[in-house]
């Protein structure tokens, strides 16, 4: 097989992942998971409850092969894409009259990613070469997280990509395709 | 917003065939590449097989020679001969495109029984 039609080749290759230590564990709170709460509407406080499950963000998946240069994974790889508004939030109307979500005053939340897991890949090279193993570093749950003022409200604006979570002295990952590609795609679909 | 239906599955004997369908939506088909996985009960999730856009096919070596992935652009649509059916290829059933962001179908059940 040639490896002409391998067109996700964006993927990072993490040799070693002990320089980005996962985030301490925390109890998973299942609640928070893939549910859309109160029916889309918010409660009748939306802003004073302090319980985080009435925050619930959207898991999406996103699949792909990993490749470095002109190797490429023995399978692809799924991980999870954090997106979607962290309700509860208000529905007001914008200037063209089209609904909008927006959350005028009260806390600002995020979907961003939680936890993340190393997978161990084998990667196929063209040639004769020796295969590789290499390991990755994949999303592996999303949360909902409230903006501090520590926060920088640039880091946190492209809500589907590890870009939202600042890391020391880490480059952010490429995707294999941008949400803006994405969302191109989406848009020629309808 | 990406959708896949998964169809085709059934309870059939060892040694028999059965040829699954994804129909997707919400994105251009023909540009994507696209796989199939399986979830076995207790299992985690595995691949099975790609069909990239140009139409070259790749497959895990447990179903290389029984098991045939193919396309219908026109239709949106990818398919999954299954040919020689073992037990152990039950499970749920589900597909998947590549490089873009998708929720997972609903899955097709594939029962093989002895």
């Known amino acids: 097989q040639g490896w002409q039609a391998f067109k996700n080749d964006a993927t990072e290759i993490i040799p070693e992942l002990g320089e980005y230590p996962e985030p301490p564990p925390e109890l998973e709170n299942n609640k928070t998971m893939n549910r859309a709460e109160n029916g889309g509407r918010p409660p009748h406080h939306p802003f004073e409850t302090k319980d985080v499950s009435e925050y619930s963000c959207r898991e999406l998946h996103f699949t792909r092969y990993v490749t470095d240069g002109p190797c490429r994974s023995a399978k692809p790889v799924t991980e999870l894409v954090c997106s979607g508004q962290c309700g509860p939030a208000r529905l007001l109307p914008n200037a063209i009259g089209r609904g909008k979500w927006w959350r005028p005053s009260g806390p600002d939340f995020r979907c961003i990613p939680d936890r993340y897991r190393a997978q161990r890949v084998q990667l196929l090279c063209p040639g004769g070469e020796a295969p590789r193993a290499r390991k990755v570093r994949l999303v592996a749950s999303c949360k909902c997280k409230r903006l501090t003022r520590f926060h920088n409200q640039s880091e946190l604006k492209d809500f589907g990509t590890e870009a939202a979570r600042p890391q020391k002295g880490r480059k952010p990952r490429p995707r294999a395709r941008s949400a803006k590609a994405n969302q191109a795609e989406l848009e020629n679909a309808y | 917003e990406v959708q896949l239906v998964e169809s085709g599955g059934g309870l059939v004997q060892a040694g028999g065939s059965l040829r699954l369908s994804c129909a997707t939506s919400?994105?251009?088909?023909?540009?994507?590449?696209m796989s199939w996985f399986r979830q076995a009960p207790g299992k985690q999730r595995e691949f099975i097989a790609t069909?990239?856009?140009?139409?070259?096919?790749d497959y895990i070596d447990s179903v290389k020679g029984r098991f045939t992935i193919s396309r219908d652009n026109a239709k949106n649509t990818v398919y999954l001969q299954m040919n020689s059916l073992k037990p152990e290829d039950t499970a749920v059933y589900y597909c998947?495109?590549?490089?873009?962001?998708?929720?997972w179908g609903q899955g097709t059940q594939v029962t093989v029984s002895s």
């Open positions: 919400g994105f251009t088909f023909s540009r994507f590449d």
């Open positions: 069909i990239f856009s140009g139409g070259d096919t």
């Open positions: 998947c495109p590549l490089g873009i962001e998708y929720a």
